[in-house]
Interface confidence: low
């Protein structure tokens, strides 16, 4: 039959070449001469010429050694034609399978593998996985089946069998207890991969196992006792640097110190922070210390790590004796801001209040007083008693100096310490209104027509406060009421000024007297320009000139 079973050819054949593999034969060769040919990759297409066929006999030939790792199988077609070129058979499938030889050693995927495991872990803990590949066939043969082993371990502490490797997966695990980073921070394993499932070619690589730090060492204060001097009232002042030693990995959470004040700081006066570079505890004042209240503080500081301890460890405690140094403190006004009600316009020399300061220092220091800021110059202060008196006219309506009825003054207290210190106080005078301003109309100049004139609405303003303001009353004086009429509109505090009789075009003075609820009267002269016009006018029209 015109059929060929799959042909197996070992790779790396020694020849001689051409090597006969199989013979193609058509039973049509009884009737006519047959010529054979092959086509396909490895024959007439790349890689061309690996295989050939003897045209007349049908022998399939191999022209060169094969490499399974390059091409593992060839699929060719065999053809049979008669002498005249006519096809006598359908194309026949020829499969050539290249069988494996153990011609490749295993290769590790890396020269050096790096893994890590925490110190103190239990046997059986997985560390890392190494991989070696072998190009040979691992499915039909053992040529590519790799077996892993550990050849050597350095250092050999605490003994030479700290790790094991799974022979088929390459997983490295801990086999013994006793991993201690502080003694051996890193192991170097020489690992082997051997093909033929351990009976063939061997290759080596290095597996570096880093022993990771676990927090199995507590930080310890060195020294444990400190003495410091701090001036009172200093905030953020560096009191002391506390130093610790820790055998764990520098700059790791197991090494980085966490400090805690565990005693002696009832007033929450101190804070402690870890210095990021040196790992020292920087003890600083959170609040100012008060020498007069307490001149010595004994603090107890405990140190742990950022990471929790992995086993029960003793906690180190440091003692810091802080001596508070006395400084001359400034007098303090009581209260710091004093509000006093006083009537505006009261006579010069009249008492306003007594405003004094207390000195925190223990010595009986003499305090003298003076005014630091008095924008209008309205007050005086007795340097010994702190008595504040009127020195000028208090004017509630003076907007340059008074805001929301309040006049603000800053006073100074100076002690006789060495050097002298100064404290300030704020005196807030609430000025009580007096009816010292009459109502004033706005605007004070108007323009009005002398025929069908529009009434003029003037706004009334009074600088005083209620009840010294509305309701207002209006009265025209000096014969102004002959031609003019004035009426107050109580709803919107306006006065309506109307022209009662015809006046010729000119400028007139209208004498308008306004009084407030407290009968404070104010006379205002309104300049009224009367124009020859009807109704509304802004400006008198030019007189008509005839042609």
């Amino acid at each position: 039959d015109w059929v060929v079973a799959p042909i197996s050819v070992p790779e790396n054949g020694k020849g001689p070449f051409p090597q006969r593999l199989n013979q193609l034969k058509s039973n049509k060769d009884r009737d006519t001469k047959i010529f054979y040919s092959i086509t396909g990759p490895g024959a007439d297409s790349p890689p061309e010429g690996v295989f050939a066929v003897e045209k007349e006999t049908g022998w399939l030939l191999l022209n060169k050694p094969l490499d399974r790792e390059e091409i593992a199988k060839y699929e060719l077609f065999g053809h049979a034609v008669s002498e005249n070129g006519a096809s006598v058979e359908d194309p026949m499938n020829i499969s050539i399978i290249v069988t494996d030889q153990n011609d490749h050693k295993p290769k590790f995927t890396q020269d050096t593998f790096r893994g890590s495991v925490l110190e103190g872990v239990l046997p059986g803990t997985s560390v890392m996985q190494v991989t070696a590949t072998d190009e040979d066939d691992a499915i039909h043969t053992y040529n590519g089946v790799v077996a892993y082993s550990i050849h050597s371990q350095e250092p050999k502490d605490p003994h030479d069998l700290m790790f094991t490797i799974h022979r088929s997966t390459g997983t490295i695990s801990v086999i013994s207890s006793g991993l201690d980073r502080e003694k051996v921070p890193e192991y170097t394993l020489t690992i082997q991969a051997t093909d033929m499932d351990g009976d063939g070619s061997t290759t080596t690589a290095v597996a570096v196992v880093e022993i990771l730090d676990a927090n199995d060492n507590a930080p310890v204060f060195d020294p444990q006792k400190y003495e410091s001097h701090v001036p009172e009232n200093a905030v953020g002042h560096e009191v002391q640097r506390l130093t610790v030693t820790d055998l764990d990995a520098p700059n790791s959470p197991a090494w980085r110190a966490t400090y805690l004040i565990v005693g002696g700081d009832d007033g929450d006066h101190f804070t402690i922070a870890t210095h990021p570079e040196s790992n020292q505890g920087i003890l600083t004042t959170r609040k100012g210390l008060d020498f007069e209240a307490k001149n010595q503080h004994t603090l107890y500081v405990e140190v742990t790590n950022e990471a929790p301890f992995v086993l029960k460890l003793p906690t180190s405690t440091a003692t810091i004796v802080v001596h508070v140094e006395d400084v001359n403190e400034a007098p303090v006004f009581v209260p710091p801001s004093k509000v006093v009600e006083v009537q505006e316009g009261i006579p010069t020399g009249e008492a306003v209040c007594v405003y004094t300061a207390k000195d925190p220092d223990k010595e009986n220091q003499k305090i003298s007083y003076r005014i630091l800021r008095d924008p209008a110059g309205w007050l005086a202060m007795d340097p010994d008693s702190g008595q504040v008196t009127v020195a000028g006219t208090l004017d509630r309506e003076d907007e340059r100096f008074v805001r929301n009825n309040i006049y603000e003054v800053m006073v100074l207290a100076v002690d006789n310490g060495s050097p002298p210190t100064t404290g300030t106080g704020t005196l807030l005078l609430t000025l009580i209104d007096v009816n010292d301003h009459g109502p004033v109309p706005e605007p004070r100049e108007i323009t009005i027509c002398n025929q069908s004139p529009e009434s003029q609405v003037l706004n009334i303003t009074d600088k005083d406060l209620s009840p010294h303001t509305s309701p207002f009353q209006a009265q025209l004086t000096d014969d102004s009421d002959i031609y003019w009429m004035a009426e107050v509109n109580e709803k919107d505090d306006t006065v309506v000024l109307s022209l009662k009789k015809f006046l010729k075009q000119d400028t007139y003075d209208v004498h308008l007297s306004l009084s407030d609820h407290g009968n404070k009267e104010q006379l205002t002269v309104i300049r009224a320009t009367v124009c020859d016009c009807h109704g509304h006018v802004e400006k008198c029209p030019d007189p008509w000139k005839g042609g």
Partner: antibody, heavy 116, light 107 residues
Framework: QVQLVQSGAEVKKPGASVKVSCKAS????????MHWVRQAPGQGLEWIGN????????NYAQKFQGRVTLTVDKSSSTAYMELSSLRSEDTAVYYC?????????WGQGTLVTVSS | DIQMTQSPSSLSASVGDRVTITCKAS??????VSWYQQKPGKAPKSLIY???NRFTGVPSRFSGSGSGTDFTLTISSLQPEDFATYFC?????????FGQGTKVEIK
């Protein structure tokens, strides 16, 4: 990563004031102190003062006392150095630098030129 | 104020040379000394703190030593990128003070 970015160059007349800013990022701002150091053209480094970035308390070199003001704006993580009553010898590159005592990170510097 | 006197003020050296810069404090500063490197037109770079501790990322050829009043910065094998000016600084007491600088130039 830690960064200190300073404001741009300034040209000022004698007697005027200058305010240089230093914007910080990449670390917990309020734990640290910010130092200010200057360097006149072709000269060495000169420490001006420092400020605690949470409390705002300061230390100044005697030479600059009364003329320099160090401030901080925690909301924008920015430290400021203001130098008043400028004179020609204040012409220098002004640096901010992070640290408690020694300095681990520096700003890029701000050139302040004082000239009439 | 504590004076920091640096010497020499300048030196010429070749690549591969061992270079030593000294700094003398006018009074005891324990080990509160740092060293900085500055290149023209650039901000200083922190090299050493506590007299002998390298900042992270600083090459191991840089080393510092000393305590009390005498301090040394050593570059074990000078590299092309090491040509710069070096400053010592004391932070033992306010005001912090710097040495006047040592310029390391190419021979």
């Amino acid at each position: 990563q830690v960064q200190l970015v300073q404001s741009g160059a300034e040209v000022k007349k004698p007697g005027a004031s200058v305010k240089v800013s230093c914007k910080a990022s990449g670390f917990t701002f309020t734990s640290y102190w910010m130092h200010w150091v200057r360097q006149a053209p072709g000269q060495g480094l000169e420490w001006i003062g420092n400020i605690q970035l949470s409390y705002g308390n300061t230390n100044y070199a005697q030479k600059f006392q009364g003329r320099v003001t160090l401030t901080v704006d925690k909301s924008s993580s920015t430290a400021y150095m203001e130098l008043s009553s400028l004179r020609s010898e204040d012409t220098a590159v002004y640096y901010c630098a992070r640290g408690f005592s020694y300095f681990d990170y520096w700003g890029q510097g701000t050139l302040v030129t004082v000239s009439s | 104020d504590i004076q920091m006197t640096q010497s020499p003020s300048s030196l010429s050296a070749s690549v591969g040379d061992r270079v030593t810069i000294t700094c003398k404090a006018s009074q005891n500063v324990d080990t509160d000394v740092s060293w900085y490197q500055q290149k023209p037109g650039k901000a200083p770079k922190s090299l050493i703190y506590w007299a002998s501790n390298r900042f992270t990322g600083v090459p191991s050829r840089f080393s510092g030593s000393g305590s009390g009043t005498d301090f040394t910065l050593t570059i074990s094998s000078l590299q092309p990128e090491d040509f710069a000016t070096y400053f010592c600084e004391q932070y033992s007491s306010y005001p912090f003070t710097f040495g006047q600088g040592t310029k390391v130039e190419i021979k």
